[in-house]
């Protein structure tokens, strides 16, 4: 008595798949595998399979049911902070070879990393034309102001909405200022926040307002304070620079916009007699803190001239260092003052038509706007590597 094993039914490949090996017939212990076309993956029911092989059994049946080759689906793309995603292939289409387009909110944000076009690839990931799987980044546009150029604090005039959208009011012990960088950092003077370096949460940070006492402002809180390691409190003002990391990103609009950091070419806009603009709520000629944000246009002063002005008592020799720049009128009358500390001295880059921070309000003579004395500012261009390192590390 002999029995022959039944051959198994000829395996019909699922749509978008193929059988291997192809044989005339499949008998006991013969097997076949299913391979899907690029952009399709094996599915048994709803479960994805890494591979599929079926074996012909003695009774002439396959030991596993035929799987399906289903088109790869990258799923709904991640939301882009301060941007949007658009479906290009068709509404909600997220399957293999579908195209989506990320874009940033107009006017106030610009796209970094790539062009924002992503394709659903066979691996199931949205991938940019450069091969990146990560989202693009919407970076705030910096240096936008309602003010186009400097016109004619101390000896200053009232700011209008949108003139200094990077202006930050810092409360916590004393009144100080800062300038918004990107959407979650504030650039300020080390001496203005030194007391809070270990208690960042004590800083009350306000922006998007002109009136110092207004209840209408955007509140921000500090996550950490980074003071330049070269700054020594109560021993001069060299390296008088600090960064505050905000615990949340702020929403950028016409009243809240970051200031640009200086480009390598920025020094060409900050030569002697070039006009910079300082803004703040510091002391005015009347001797009181300003209620409304004030600004003053002041020329850069020759470095040697400034050094000489602060060589005589009561100032110790070497008060003005290479990390500082000076601005003001020889005749006096226009200056930043106490309460303006940490604020930005800004310049217009005529090539990019964006404002950038050239200086940080640091120190000056006891009497603001005094003839023959000048306001002294931290020279920001000297600290670009320090700023970039802190921001990239944290």
């Amino acid at each position: 008595y002999t029995s022959t094993a039944q051959p198994c039914p000829y395996p019909m490949a699922p749509p978008n798949g193929h059988v291997s090996p192809v044989q005339a017939k499949y008998i006991l212990k013969d097997s076949f595998s299913i391979f899907c076309e690029t952009g399709y993956e094996l599915l048994q029911g709803h479960l994805p399979l890494k591979s599929f092989t079926a074996v012909c059994q003695k009774d002439g049946s396959w030991d596993r049911p035929m799987p399906a080759c289903s088109i790869v689906d990258c799923g709904p793309p991640d939301d882009l902070p301060s941007g949007r995603v658009e479906y290009i292939t068709g509404p909600g289409v997220t399957t293999y070879k579908a195209v989506i387009q990320y874009s940033c909110e107009e006017t106030f944000y610009t796209m970094k990393v790539n062009d924002g076009k992503y394709v659903c690839e066979a691996d199931g990931f949205w991938t940019s034309s450069k091969g990146e799987k990560s989202l693009p980044v919407c970076e705030p546009v910096c240096g936008l102001s309602a003010r186009t150029t400097g016109g004619r604090i101390y000896g200053g005039q009232k700011a209008k909405p949108g003139d200094f959208p990077w202006q930050v009011l810092i409360l916590g012990g004393t009144t100080a200022a800062g300038a918004l960088l990107y959407d979650n950092w504030v650039l300020t003077a080390a001496h203005a926040v030194y007391e809070q370096k270990h208690d960042a949460s004590a800083l009350d940070i306000r922006m998007g307002t002109l009136k110092r006492l207004s209840p209408h402002y955007t509140q921000a809180w500090s996550e950490a304070v980074f003071i330049h390691e070269g700054y020594t409190h109560d021993a001069g003002f060299d390296n008088d620079i600090a960064l505050i990391k905000l615990n949340n990103k702020v929403v950028i609009n016409s009243n809240i916009t970051p200031i640009c950091l200086p480009r390598k070419e920025a020094e060409s806009f900050m030569r002697t007699d070039d006009i910079g603009t300082a803004s703040g709520w510091g002391l005015t000629q009347r001797g009181f803190l300003a209620r409304n944000l004030m600004y003053v246009d002041i020329p850069i002063v020759d470095h040697q001239k400034c050094t000489a002005a602060y060589e005589k008592p009561p100032y110790p020799r070497g008060s003005v260092t290479a990390n500082m720049l000076c601005a003001g009128l020889e005749s006096g009358g226009k200056d930043s003052c106490r309460g303006d500390s940490g604020g930005a001295l800004v310049f217009l880059d005529s090539e990019t038509e964006r404002w950038f921070v050239g200086g940080i309000v640091s120190w000056g003579s006891m009497n603001c706007g005094e003839a023959g004395q000048y306001g002294v500012y931290t020279k920001v261009i000297n600290y670009i590597p320090w700023i970039e390192n802190i921001i990239s590390d944290f």
Partner: antibody, heavy 116, light 111 residues
Framework: DVQLVESGGGLVQPGGSRKLSCAAS????????MHWVRQAPEKGLEWVAY????????FYADTVKGRFTISRDNPKNTLFLQMTSLRSEDTAMYYC?????????WGAGTTVTVSS | DIVLTQSPASLAVSLGQRATISCRAS??????????MHWFQQKPGQPPNLLIK???NLESGVPARFSGSGSGTDFTLNIHPVEEDDTATYYC?????????FGGGTKLEIK
């Protein structure tokens, strides 16, 4: 409260034009693709047109292609449907609906009647 | 275009019983991750209301009496137990490709 309110419907002569509007509120309009869907009297639902969140892509049903134009004004939170060369078979209740992957929010609709 | 065939066209179900509505697509609307089939309820004089998205996901605020199942080309909407308020027309709709199309509708009546 998320809301869509259509307007602009009415009686139109065959061959005439009409512009429908859909005012959105209660959500970030500029983040969503939007559609127009219509329903002829005592009939089923028919998808008409889609526009992506930033107006980069548009899609139309074959029955309206070349005659209808979908557009949007994100700052004003408004969706539009410009209808031209209207026919009697365009008579329907027109709904605007939100969503890129499904119609998750609908307006109450506005009626367009094409008749001489 | 993908054609969706709904059955039955009308249905009368006793209060508390189960209502089952079927929808067949002329081609598969299922990918490796999702089925692009959705179910709507429409009451007279009202716009449609999303009940189930992606074949089986209940939209928020929709009672758990409603459930959906299926993949590929065959999908089902179940309502159990049926309530008086469920009197309406039910539509399936796909979003696999343009044009998005709807089934012809199923009119549910409660006995």
């Amino acid at each position: 409260d998320v809301q869509l309110v259509e307007s602009g419907g009415g009686l139109v002569q065959p061959g005439g034009s009409r512009k429908l509007s859909c005012a959105a509120s209660g959500f970030t309009f500029s983040s969503f693709g939007m559609h127009w869907v219509r329903q002829a009297p005592e009939k089923g639902l028919e998808w008409v047109a889609y526009i992506s969140s930033g107006s980069s892509s548009f899609f139309y049903a074959d029955t309206v292609k070349g005659r209808f134009t979908i557009s949007r004004d994100n700052p004003k939170n408004t969706l539009f449907l410009q209808m031209t060369s209207l026919r009697s078979e365009d008579t329907a209740m027109y709904y605007c609906a939100r969503g890129d992957r499904n119609f998750d929010v609908w307006g109450a609709g506005t009626t367009v009647t094409v008749s001489s | 275009d993908i054609v969706l065939t709904q059955s039955p066209a009308s249905l009368a179900v006793s209060l508390g019983q189960r209502a089952t509505i079927s929808c067949r697509a002329s081609q598969s609307v299922t990918s490796s991750r999702y089925s692009y089939m959705h179910w709507f309820q429409q009451k007279p004089g009202q716009p449609p209301n999303l009940l189930i998205k992606h074949a089986s996901n209940l939209e928020s605020g929709v009672p758990a009496r409603f459930s959906g199942s299926g993949s590929g080309t065959d999908f089902t909407l179940n309502i159990h137990p049926v309530e008086e308020d469920d009197t309406a027309t039910y539509y399936c709709q796909h979003s696999w490709e343009v044009p998005w199309t709807f089934g012809g509708g199923t009119k549910l009546e409660i006995k």
